[in-house]
């Protein structure tokens, strides 16, 4: 058993049929010695008396808010949460495995630039009695500060018969240098509590590996005289690190017909313009990627090829 | 003589082309090593990220773009950065700070060159002959060093008589290649910035 925060305790349980559970001793936070009784949650049933209460925690029925009373007055509370371990592995019932970029990916994080600011998100099908808290640092043995904001419900989606909820959090490294060469990874720890179940999820990454630029902006087409070619131009996204000559992007340009069954025309360039063959009903798209470190490509920015 | 007067390539700044080749070679060599050493801990998540140039050079700080000098987090170790009013060609106009930046890059390359050669000598003694560095990566390091053209004391190649631990040597190669690729990214950024200045 360990303390998660004041008056909230996590009991770690090996979860298998007929498991013996954990013996837990609760102590009433009071100078009083006599006439103390204990109850669990809203039930008025007295579980025991005395300054301490010893319980065997085996299942969720044994978890909850234990309160010690004297003369009808509550003296202190202890909330017990369960953290299940099945076959030596901590449970991951609350969050959905996003399977990207690999299996057992519960937290996904992205950064729009090298400023030390990043966003993490996770998915769940649970809609009520759910709370999250997030901690982050650079490195674990001698951690350097990362400040995370409040967790927000960022999206709701219908997936078949189920509703899926996306939660996200924004974090900022306290003293980040965009040009720095990262040697220690950023660690992100998410505590999830659903009713009386506690779970924790972690992710470890370098900012350079989670970079995903915003799409290029101001995408424009200029038809060339007496030609079916057009000159397309675009600009670096506003959110990208500066100076651009140091934090350079490379671009992929694509001309795609109205159908996915039509062949695409793709060009790769470091410039912010290109000449392409445009055709009726096609659209022109451009995406960006760090020129020197192959992290994610941005989403596409698109305009019709008319 | 601090900076080269190498023949200009398509860029005004002849080191840019060499730095691009350096990054390509670093990335390809790392990718190849990860494939060959697939049963060794050789991924970014598995290795310790060491920096053999730590406390010996200060490339990131010495080569900071002007725009980042105001960022205190970028100047935690040394308050040095270049002023960009020159190129690898215009050696007399090149500022002291830029020379410091390019010298730091040169020293990095020299250190990695020695490490890679030492490691290759060990790996060539491996009866498995599983992996060794091809001449491409050593060649591109050499080309960029020549383009930078600094005089420098030659660092003796470390040689050991005892039989190396080949497992440890291969892990060390992974660590070295990861670090070298990160430094190659920095070098390419710097050269691109200088080329645009």
């Amino acid at each position: 058993i360990w303390e998660l925060k004041k008056d909230v305790y996590v009991v770690e349980l090996d979860w298998y049929p007929d498991a013996p559970g954990e013996m837990v001793v609760l102590t009433c936070d009071t100078p009083e010695e006599d006439g103390i009784t204990w109850t669990l949650d809203q039930s008025g049933e007295v579980l025991g008396s005395g300054k301490t209460l010893t319980i065997q925690v085996k299942e969720f029925g044994d978890a909850g808010q234990y309160t010690c009373h004297k003369g009808g007055e509550a003296l202190s509370h202890s909330l017990l949460l369960l953290h299940k371990k099945e076959d030596g592995i901590w449970s991951t019932d609350v969050l959905k495995d996003q399977k990207e970029p690999k299996n057992k990916t519960f937290l996904r994080c992205e950064a729009k630039n090298y400023s030390g600011r990043f966003t993490c998100w996770w998915l769940t099908t649970i809609s009520t009695d759910l709370t999250f808290s997030v901690k982050s640092s650079r490195g674990s043995s001698n951690p350097q500060g990362v400040t995370c904001g409040a967790v927000t419900l960022s999206a709701e989606r219908v997936r078949g018969d189920n509703k899926e909820y996306e939660y996200s959090v924004e974090c900022q490294e306290d003293s980040a240098c965009p040009a720095a060469e990262e040697r220690l990874p950023i660690e992100v720890m998410v505590d999830a509590i659903h009713k009386l179940k506690y779970e924790n999820y972690t992710s470890s990454f370098f900012i350079r590996d989670i970079i995903k630029p915003d799409p290029p902006k101001n995408l424009q087409l200029k038809p060339l005289k007496n030609s079916r070619q057009v000159e397309v131009s675009w600009e670096y996204p506003d959110t990208w690190s500066t100076p651009h000559s140091y934090f350079s992007l490379t671009f992929c340009i694509q001309v795609q017909g109205k159908s996915k069954r039509e062949k695409k025309d793709r060009i790769f360039t470091d410039k912010t313009s290109a000449t392409v063959i445009c055709r009726k009903n096609a659209s022109f798209s451009v995406q960006a990627q760090d020129r020197y470190y192959s992290s994610s490509w941005s989403e596409w920015a698109s305009v019709p090829c008319s | 003589r601090n900076l080269s007067v190498a023949t200009p390539g398509p860029e005004m700044f002849p080191c840019l082309h060499h730095s691009q080749n350096l990054l390509k070679a670093a990335s390809n060599t790392l990718q190849k090593a990860r494939q060959i050493l697939e049963f060794y801990p050789c991924t970014s998540e598995e290795i310790d990220h060491e920096d053999i140039t730590k406390d010996k050079t200060s490339t990131v700080e010495a080569c900071l773009p002007l725009e980042l000098i105001k960022n205190e987090s970028c100047l935690n170790s040394r308050e040095t950065s270049f002023i960009t009013n020159g190129s690898c060609l215009a050696s007399r106009k090149t500022s002291f700070m830029m020379a410091l930046c390019l010298r730091s890059i040169y020293e990095d390359l020299k250190m990695y060159q020695v490490e890679f050669k030492t490691m290759n000598a060990k790996l060539l003694r491996d009866p498995k002959r599983q992996i060794f560095l091809d001449q491409n990566i050593l060649g591109v390091i050499d080309e960029l060093m020549q383009a930078l053209n600094f005089n420098s004391e030659t660092v003796p190649q470390k040689s050991s008589l005892e039989e190396p631990d080949f497992y440890k040597t291969k892990i060390k190669l992974c660590i070295l290649l990861h670090a070298f690729r990160i430094r190659a990214v920095t070098i390419d950024r710097v050269m691109s910035y200088l080329n645009a200045s």
Epitope: Q229, G257, S259, R261, K263, R266 | -
Partner: antibody, heavy 114, light 106 residues
Framework: QSLEESGGRLVTPGTPLTLTCTAS????????MTWVRQAPGGGLEWIGT????STYYASWAKGRFTISRTSTTVDLKMTSLTTEDTATYFC????????????WGPGTLVTVSS | LVMTQTPASVSAAVGGTVTINCQAS??????LAWYQQKPGQRPKLLIY???TLTSGVPSRFKGSGSGKQFTLTISGVQREDAATYYC?????????FGGGTKVVVV
Amino acid sequence: QSLEESGGRLVTPGTPLTLTCTASGFSLSSYWMTWVRQAPGGGLEWIGTIATSSTYYASWAKGRFTISRTSTTVDLKMTSLTTEDTATYFCARGLTTDYDLDLWGPGTLVTVSS
Amino acid sequence: LVMTQTPASVSAAVGGTVTINCQASEDIESYLAWYQQKPGQRPKLLIYSASTLTSGVPSRFKGSGSGKQFTLTISGVQREDAATYYCLGADDTTTVFGGGTKVVVV
């Protein structure tokens, strides 16, 4: 508007050969360009296509045939030629992409024989 | 992608009707064209987008179909229509000609 292929000749097996397609009356760089071949007495066979810079090839042509373009020409580079590659080689212009070929050259004959 | 063209050859009297079929091994929507080739000549585009007639091509040529099944119909066949006809289908990675249909006008 017209297209013309050149470079076809008699070669021995294994010899590399490059065919060139040139245009009159229009700009090649404004169109997807395609190479097609026809063995003597046989049907038409699509070799590959070049867009602005993307290339697509028939599975049998991948690795052995390469299409490239300059502002005025489209080339078909062929390696490891065998007697099976004996054919008339046509270059054609795509109206939109590479299936609606509205303008064809007269073709150039490549004969591979030992 | 495989394009199966039938029949391999067909005879027709002047004024008659000829139907040529082309089957794609997968859905290619309307990315199909029909070509006419006479001996010793280069191919000529008749129809593209499965049913759009190329300018200058007589209206007796008609293309239909989409997805996997396509048809070229020549109504009121003329002597000059004697030729080999090919379908050409395309998807997002490859392009394939049918085997050809030789039309003989009697």
